[in-house]
């Protein structure tokens, strides 16, 4: 981080509580190109050998308010014949994300950062480690 | 969210730019139980039929500054014999996350929200939709 020389209007970096009162512009900047976003397929959830469903998680006191979470459809994976393969497990890939939660009993536009573990999709795993030869 | 009646110290929700100057406490609250966090296996990337690697993406002007990104190891999936299956593709599951980026030419603790598309893991897909029977 480039530490800008402190002025009276900037929080003091040496103060113990400087992280507790930062200013944030919540108008989302779309740094993704629309091409990149539109190329990203949303049908993997049906085409995967470990298909998943998405459930809607909404919390009006959170930013982002709406998060779609994955759940694996089956405990096993789907084989080429469309049957469940009992030697392979369908497992949830989770990611830890940061969300902003409204600080209770404070202004509606005062937030704190919280970690959240969300399911993103599923993958098919064997019970033993195999490497492609 | 309980909308607290506006006081002079709270931004006015009717103002068009109220989202552009919110206060955030960046001291991360770990709302994940240590159990949930410790139960989360990190070996799926090797055991998956669509294995992946993780690379470290660091940006000191971003919060969080370190993000681990997945890349699929192969274009195809690995079958039960450990061989690449040319009928099945290994694809990256991506998630759009929000990060905080330092506002250039501003105080070091003034941020804006940006979208970022990150690879979380890989899954194995067929070129046609199959459903488990």
């Amino acid at each position: 981080a480039v530490l800008i020389p402190q002025s009276s209007v900037c929080p003091n970096a040496e103060a113990n509580n400087f992280l507790q009162n930062v200013k944030v512009n919540l108008k989302v900047i779309n740094s993704l190109s629309s091409k990149a976003s539109s190329r990203r397929p949303s049908d993997y959830l049906n085409r995967s050998t470990s298909p998943w469903t998405l459930s809607r998680n909404e919390d009006p006191d959170r930013y982002p308010s709406v998060i779609w979470e994955a759940q694996c459809r089956h405990q096993r994976c789907v084989n080429a014949e469309g049957k469940l393969d009992h030697h392979m497990n369908s497992v949830l890939i989770q990611q830890e994300i940061l969300v902003l939660k409204r600080e209770p009993e404070k202004c509606p536009f005062t937030f704190r950062v919280e970690k959240m573990l969300v399911g993103v999709g599923c993958t098919c795993v064997s019970s033993i480690v195999r490497h492609a030869s | 969210a309980v909308l607290i009646p506006q006081s002079s110290v709270c931004p006015n929700a009717e103002a068009n730019n109220f989202l552009q100057n919110v206060k955030v406490n960046l001291k991360v609250i770990n709302s994940l139980s240590s159990k949930a966090s410790s139960r989360r296996p990190s070996d799926y990337l090797n055991r998956s039929t669509s294995p992946w690697t993780l690379s470290r993406n660091e940006d000191p002007d971003r919060y969080p500054s370190v993000i681990w990104e997945a890349q699929c190891r192969h274009q195809r999936c690995v079958n039960a014999e450990g061989k690449l299956d040319h009928h099945m593709n290994s694809v990256l599951i991506q998630q759009e996350i929000l990060v905080l980026k330092r506002e250039p030419e501003k105080c070091p603790f003034t941020f804006r929200v940006e979208k970022m598309l990150v690879g979380v893991g890989c899954t194995c897909v067929s070129s046609i939709v199959r459903h488990a029977s």
Epitope: L26, V28, N30, S34, S37, S42, D43, L45, L54, S55, R56, E58, P60, Y63, P64, S65, V66, W68, P108 | A1, V2, L3, A13, L19, E96, L98
Partner: antibody, heavy 121, light 106 residues
């Protein structure tokens, strides 16, 4: 400016299916969910369900589960609703409306002009 | 599901008159939303998150309430306010709408 342009009125036969479209412009399509609402003189406004163009996620009012299928095409910024096994009960005006994913405080802020569906033999 | 009951179903008011319509929820909800609809047009977001006026809505409109009881008030009725007003909740699935309050000008 923000616009949700819906497809034209349809007169359809009972037992058939119909697909309605909702083309979005003037905003980033994937920042908003698309919700669908039905309006009839008898039942008033009824929420059908939601599609998230970003993830492909869908969630339905149980009443319309199996009746409606919601999809979206990110490349053309268009949302679709397919209505199946149509009966006279499905006649009505169908609206698409957008909902900001990041801050739900705003609710459903812009609506399409509506598509009238008449099911008759 | 949460049932929203609007009253009165139909009302008429003279220009300059104060108008209040209510929306009663069968269970407690966190926010109410109000939509205005005129014949042959789509609903317009009118009041969001119980209190906030949508862009372009005249200041004579206001929203209030909490829990199960909410209201929309017009401080001084004008001809252009004649329309049907619907309340809406999204605190619980399925999201629901009230049956509407039709406001006519005398």
């Amino acid at each position: 400016q923000v616009q949700l342009q819906q497809s034209g009125a349809e007169l359809v036969r009972p037992g058939t299916s119909v697909t309605l479209s909702c083309k979005a412009s003037g905003y980033i399509f994937t920042d908003y969910e698309i919700h669908w609402v039905k309006q009839t003189p008898v039942h008033g406004l009824e929420w059908i369900g939601v599609n998230d163009p970003e993830s492909g996620g869908t969630f339905y009012n149980q009443k319309f589960d199996g009746k409606a299928e919601l999809t979206a095409d990110k490349s053309s910024s268009t949302a679709y609703m397919e209505l199946r096994s149509l009966t006279s009960e499905d006649s009505g005006v169908y609206y698409c409306t957008r909902y900001y994913r990041y801050e739900s405080f705003y609710g459903m802020d812009y609506w399409g002009q509506g598509t009238s569906i008449t099911v008759s033999s | 599901q949460i049932v929203l009951t609007q009253s009165p179903a139909i009302m008429s008011a003279s220009p300059g008159e104060k108008v209040t319509m209510t929306c009663s929820a069968s269970s407690s909800i966190s926010y109410i939303y109000w939509f205005q609809q005129k014949p042959g047009t789509s609903p317009k977001r009118w009041i969001y998150a119980t209190f906030e006026l949508a862009s372009g809505v005249p200041a004579r409109f206001s929203g209030s309430g909490s829990g199960t009881s909410y209201s929309l008030t017009i401080s001084s009725m004008e001809a252009e306010d004649a329309a049907t007003y619907y309340c809406h909740q999204r605190s619980s699935y399925p999201w629901t709408f009230g049956g509407g309050s039709k406001l006519e000008i005398k």
